[in-house]
Amino acid sequence: GILELAGTVGCVGPRTPIAYMKYGCFCGLGGHGQPRDAIDWCCHGHDCCYTRAEEAGCSPKTERYSWQCVNQSVLCGPAENKCQELLCKCDQEIANCLAQTEYNLKYLFYPQFLCEPDSPKCD
């Protein structure tokens, strides 16, 4: 869910999760175009991960799951079902991805009309 996503990103990374609410073409609600930088690629990957979870019958934005923050690292579980496992891995992945990036202020509140209609394919 949204709470878990914010929590996991805050656990691993050096920045507040709010920094990614409206960033580039993919960080925030929705998303399309060519990712603008490494952060945007992380968000694109996370969108793909959530899409795969939805295809598996999960509800990424509302499903809650248990996880722990230990030494700035996300530990998933104990999970009750496959959806909780998948979603924690999605959020764990983006948290680790974002923690390795540099922040470009010019992409904060990036105008969506500058984002191309087509997006890179998911892996």
Partner: antibody, heavy 114, light 112 residues
């Protein structure tokens, strides 16, 4: 109806090995992490192991780590617990379960004694 | 590890009366996602444990509404109103906030 049926328990000498099985039915087995929980002769419940739905992640308490191995065969809807270097304190009734969701199986008894 | 403590090994009760069974955790089981990862189980004589309550206060399906759960992050209570003969057994609390999953020692409900 969700059903879990354990088998494979028995009497083993200290240091010996044994493999428990659990046949699952009535639900989509591959969609759920599965666990083994044991109940000691003193009636205490102890978590023994958990395996993720796909079988790629496993979790153990320190008391069995390195001695017990949990595995699963999603094609056969079966959960396993391979136990080695068994000790007298492993004597218990072993349940196959989805602890947070239920139900639990009826259990299979392991006795470790010389 | 999170230690689950059930202080009372047994609780005597008269059929028709209400009874409360307590459980305490060594760490708050309230997750940042708003869920309290506390469960209650009943093990009737000769049977395997069955889930009664999940997430501290949610009634499992098929469980009579005579059962209810409440608590804070570390102190929990299972309440049974109008106790019946079929309620006899051992009640266990369990946490699934983190590994290792841990259980209380159990509280035996006995009829007077």
């Amino acid at each position: 109806e969700v059903k879990l049926v354990e088998s494979g328990g028995g009497l083993v000498k200290p240091g010996g090995s044994l493999k428990l099985s659990c046949a699952a039915s009535g639900f989509t087995f591959s969609n759920y992490p599965m666990s083994w929980v044991r109940q000691t002769p003193a009636k205490r419940l102890e978590w023994v192991a958990t395996i993720s739905s796909g079988g790629d992640d496993t979790y153990y308490p320190d008391s069995v780590k390195g001695r017990f191995t949990i595995s699963r065969d999603n094609a056969r809807n079966t959960l396993y617990l391979q136990m080695s270097c068994l000790r007298s304190e492993d004597t218990a009734l072993y349940y196959c379960a989805r602890p947070q969701l239920g139900p639990w199986g009826q259990g299979t008894t392991l006795t470790v004694s010389s | 590890d999170i230690v689950m403590t059930q202080a009372a090994p047994s609780v005597p009760v008269t059929p028709g009366d209400s009874v409360s069974i307590s459980c305490r955790s060594s760490k708050s089981l309230l997750h940042s996602n708003g869920i309290t990862y506390l469960y209650w189980f009943l093990q009737r004589p000769g049977q395997s444990p069955q889930r009664l309550i999940y997430y501290m206060s949610n009634l499992a399906s098929g469980v009579p509404d005579r059962f209810s759960g409440r608590g804070s992050g570390t102190d929990f209570t299972l309440r049974i109103s109008r106790v019946e003969a079929e309620d006899v057994g051992v009640y266990y609390c369990m946490q699934s906030l983190e590994y290792p999953l841990t259980f209380g020692a159990g509280t035996k409900l006995e009829l007077k």
